[in-house]
Interface confidence: low
């Protein structure tokens, strides 16, 4: 609800006349720029030569609105663009698998107190790359032989481990059956189990993997940087705020 | 904790130089706008000059040509070369550098006194 407020007072910011009569910014854009089909852009603008405050920044194509960071709110990316639209860096904006219909102009419209509003144009176009289709085709079975390789190294891995774990439960169970019989109404841990609690293979923020040989201290941490991470990510879009 | 600590500021004579440092610490100066602006007594704060990320500089209309902004990677400082300076220079010179981190965007320095008089 309140983004839809917030849109409506956006559209309302964009059609008013400045209030104040002098403005000193200038918008420094990445001006005219290409990519590739299937590729990703960063658009960047810099608001510079003034003092004023940013409370919000729009970006746009043509008409569409693509996204709105705003001081007090952060990010909302337009939701018909929510895949392949990311926030940032910066009051950037990254432009995922891109398309040649995604050629055109762009542009950040930045609302600032008391100036008003400044507007930066970046033209986008997106190229049908040969150079990157001839990689694409050398690629492939590259990759299909890696995996290949891969598959065959795991199972050899596995082979080996098996036999050998075989080998010592053939010892052990050779020298220590009876006490296998004692206990044998006792649940017996078994690797397709949950890791018990403390383990930090779990950890939902950490990619998978990251902690397997570590300490439960150093995973914990690892854990904590990535949360912050995400807590950054999901934060208020940088606005400044003088401190002088 | 993001820091900026201008130096080289004093007094000089009219049509004498001066060299500014902002000396940056706690965020990576090389993708960070840097930029110097004064602050005369009674008046506005006002820009003078910016450096951007790609090494594109601007400069206000009244020190074009006179003022020179720079910025040194290695050693995470930035520069004001003042050349030609006249009396309407005298003020208070702030180095202040864009930082995307967290909620601050504009991280300004104490200052630094430029006073030009004969």
């Known amino acids: 609800m309140r983004w839809c407020l917030l849109l409506i007072w956006a559209q309302g910011l964009r059609q008013a006349p400045l209030a104040s009569g002098m403005m000193t910014g200038t918008i420094e854009t990445t001006g005219n720029i290409s990519a590739e089909k299937g590729g990703s852009i960063i658009l960047q603008c810099h608001l510079s030569s003034t003092t004023a405050q940013v409370t919000q920044v729009n970006w746009e194509q043509q008409d569409q609105l693509l996204a709105i960071c705003n001081a007090d709110l952060g990010w909302h990316i337009s939701p018909s663009f929510k895949d392949r639209v990311a926030p940032g860096p910066g009051l950037g904006l990254t432009l995922q698998s891109l398309t040649v219909n995604d050629t055109g102009e762009y542009f950040c419209i930045y609302h600032t107190y008391p100036d008003g509003t400044y507007t930066g144009r970046i033209f986008l176009e997106v190229l049908e790359s040969s150079v990157a289709e001839h990689g694409a085709r050398f690629q492939i079975p590259l990759l299909g032989a890696m995996a290949a390789t891969l598959v065959v190294i795991c199972t050899a891995v596995i082979v080996v481990v098996a036999l050998t774990r075989k080998k010592k439960a053939l010892r052990i169970h050779s020298v220590e059956g009876d006490l296998r019989r004692k206990s044998a109404g006792q649940e017996e841990w078994s690797p397709s189990a949950p890791s018990p609690p403390g383990s930090c293979v779990q950890a939902e923020a950490a990619p998978a993997g990251l902690c397997g040989e570590q300490r439960g201290e150093d995973c914990a941490e690892l854990h904590d940087y990535f949360n912050v991470l995400s807590y950054r990510s999901l934060g208020n879009c940088s606005f400044f705020t003088e401190t002088g | 904790e993001v820091q900026l600590v201008e130096s080289g500021g004093g007094l000089v004579q009219p049509g004498g130089s001066l060299r500014l440092s902002c000396a940056a610490s706690?965020?990576?100066?090389?993708?960070?706008?840097m930029g110097w602006f004064r602050q005369a007594p009674g008046k506005e704060r006002e820009f003078v000059a910016s450096?951007?990320?790609?090494?594109?500089?601007f400069y206000a209309d009244s020190v074009k040509g006179r003022f020179t902004i720079s910025a040194d990677n290695s050693k995470n400082t930035a520069y004001l070369q003042m050349n030609s300076l006249k009396p309407e220079d005298t003020a208070v010179y702030y180095c202040?550098?864009?930082?995307?981190?967290?909620?601050?965007?504009?991280?300004w320095g104490q200052g630094t006194l430029v006073t030009v008089s004969s």
């Open positions: 450096i951007s990320t790609s090494g594109n500089t």
């Open positions: 202040a550098a864009d930082v995307w981190y967290g909620s601050t965007w504009r991280n």
């Open positions: 706690g965020f990576t100066f090389s993708t960070s706008w």
